[in-house]
């Protein structure tokens, strides 16, 4: 059960996650005109990833496309790459883990098949929430920097008379999204790696037993098990991952001291 | 068709308050902004107060404190409350909406004329 | 405040001569977002209300003839007439409109030579 909600609780947790992703990555309001020290201003500008915009105070809006991809700066296109990036992966991941997600049942889907769908999904979020975290962090670093270097040299003065200042850009709504919906995103595929873990199927010992005519003892075989002696640190049975399912004819039994009734 | 019509003007003692208004037709306040912008006898334009279409206001810096810029959108009508009235405030008021864009003031009333004497 | 300066104070300018109105703002009124300019011209005639000519330092308002013309960028603008006509005799002014208070040039008075 606690499995089972771990699972769906990383799943909800990366969707709204991606969902800030994706907004974050629509978002306009990347960088923000800084107002501190500045005169009042009646026109505010603020940029996004794909477009800038600048609002007057009577309400109009106008936004401009960056309709040019080389003119860009490098920066920019890498930030926009490592946003894309995290979407795709993480909308992968969250088709993935609808399959994976342990109340929804699909034909005669095996636990162990589901266990390793989840912990790829959960792998996918969580690299996708690290693309949504650097990328945002990206463009944070490159607005500080942008920021001191205008500051240094905010004021150009013509003759001491005219002042020309030079717009200087601050943290945009759309960061704040960014860090938390890829914080929420890496939060969801931890959460659904560890629900991996609880994921394959608790069986019974003893559930295959074949019984072979081998001369003066019945040997049963475990299926799927390795017998254990009950003493130590290693109290229950350890389920093996074997990459599959098999028939009872094609795993060999060894006789051993616990392979006799 | 667009249209500003400016009253409340009259003489006023100093240190008095008087409300002007300006009943605007052919938009609505929801949608524009409007100035009050004043004009002293053979001087020069002085811009006084705005309101938005939102309903954020701005003013002139020396006129802050005093002056008052309102609206009431129902009744298509802005207002410029204005306190502590000088002998310097005699002036012609206009009202004047904003044309929206570029931030230009495109339609004028004819003015309202206040004096403030003893 | 921004302080907008118009030269010269008055001009005589004969009929059918270009008029040329200055006026420099204290600071730049160009958006680097939009690369507009935030300056309107204004006319005034006695009596009467201004009147809008010229919004974003050069777009004409609708109604307004095409002999006025309204160039220039970030502190220095120019506002011609460039035949002037009978009709134009009136005081010009110039308005920032970037920066709170809006404020206005101190006028330019045009005459008929």
């Known amino acids: 059960m606690a499995v089972t909600a771990c699972q769906g609780l990383g799943f909800v947790v990366s969707l709204i996650g991606i969902a800030g992703i994706i907004a974050a990555t629509c978002m306009d309001q990347w960088s923000t005109q800084d107002l501190y020290n500045n005169p009042v201003t009646a026109v505010f500008n603020y940029q996004g990833l794909w477009r800038s915009c600048v609002r007057e105070s009577s309400g109009f809006t106008e936004c401009r496309g960056y309709f040019t991809l080389l003119g860009l700066p490098a920066m920019l296109q890498a930030v926009r790459a490592l946003m894309i990036v995290g979407i795709v992966l993480g909308a992968i991941g969250l088709l993935v883990s609808i399959f994976a997600l342990k109340c929804i049942r699909i034909g005669s889907m095996e636990d162990s098949a589901k266990a390793n769908m989840t912990l790829t999904s959960g792998i996918m979020f969580i690299v996708s929430g690290l693309c949504a975290i650097a990328g945002v962090s990206v463009f944070a670093n490159m607005l500080v920097t942008n920021f001191w270097m205008s500051t240094a040299n905010m004021y150009t003065g013509m003759g001491g008379m005219v002042q020309t200042v030079q717009t200087r850009y601050t943290f945009g709504a759309a960061l704040f999204v960014g860090w938390v919906a890829g914080g929420l995103t890496l939060i969801g595929g931890v959460m659904m790696c560890i629900a991996c873990r609880g994921l394959a199927p608790e069986e019974t010992n003893y559930k295959a037993v074949s019984y072979h005519a081998s001369g003066h003892s019945v040997a049963y075989k475990p299926g799927g098990f390795k017998a254990s002696t009950g003493f130590g640190s290693n109290t229950k049975n350890k389920k093996i991952y074997d990459g599959g399912a098999r028939t009872e004819d094609e795993v060999q039994s060894y006789p051993s001291k616990h392979d006799y009734v | 068709q667009v249209q500003l019509v400016e009253s409340g003007g009259g003489v006023v003692q100093p240190g008095r308050s008087l409300r002007l208004s300006c009943a605007a037709s052919g938009f609505t306040l929801t949608s524009y902004g409007v100035y009050w912008v004043r004009q002293a006898p053979g001087k020069g334009l002085e811009w006084v107060a705005v309101v938005w279409a939102g309903g954020n206001t701005n003013y002139a810096d020396a006129l802050k404190g005093r002056f008052t810029i309102s609206k009431d959108n129902s009744k298509s009508t802005l207002y410029l409350q204005m306190n502590s009235l000088r002998a310097e405030d005699t002036a012609v008021y206009y009202c004047?909406?904003?044309?929206?864009?570029?931030?230009?003031?495109?339609?004028w009333g004819q003015g309202t004329l206040v004096t403030v004497s003893s | 405040d921004i302080v907008m300066t118009q030269s010269p104070d008055s001009l005589a300018v004969s009929l059918g001569e270009r008029a040329t109105i200055n006026c420099k703002s204290s600071?730049?009124?160009?958006?680097?977002?939009?690369?507009?300019?935030?300056l309107a011209w204004y006319q005034q005639k006695p009596g009467q209300p201004p009147k809008l000519l010229i919004y974003g330092a050069s777009t004409r308002e609708s109604g307004v003839p095409d002999r006025f013309t309204g160039s220039g960028s970030g502190t220095d603008f120019t506002l011609t007439i460039s035949s002037l006509q009978a009709e134009d005799v009136a005081v010009y002014y110039c308005?920032?409109?970037?920066?709170?208070?809006?404020?206005f040039g101190q006028g330019t008075k045009v005459e008929i030579k």
């Open positions: 600071q730049s009124l160009l958006n680097s977002g939009n690369q507009k300019n935030y």
């Open positions: 004047a909406r904003d044309r929206g864009r570029l931030l230009a003031m495109d339609y």
């Open positions: 308005q920032n409109d970037h920066f709170f208070p809006f404020t």
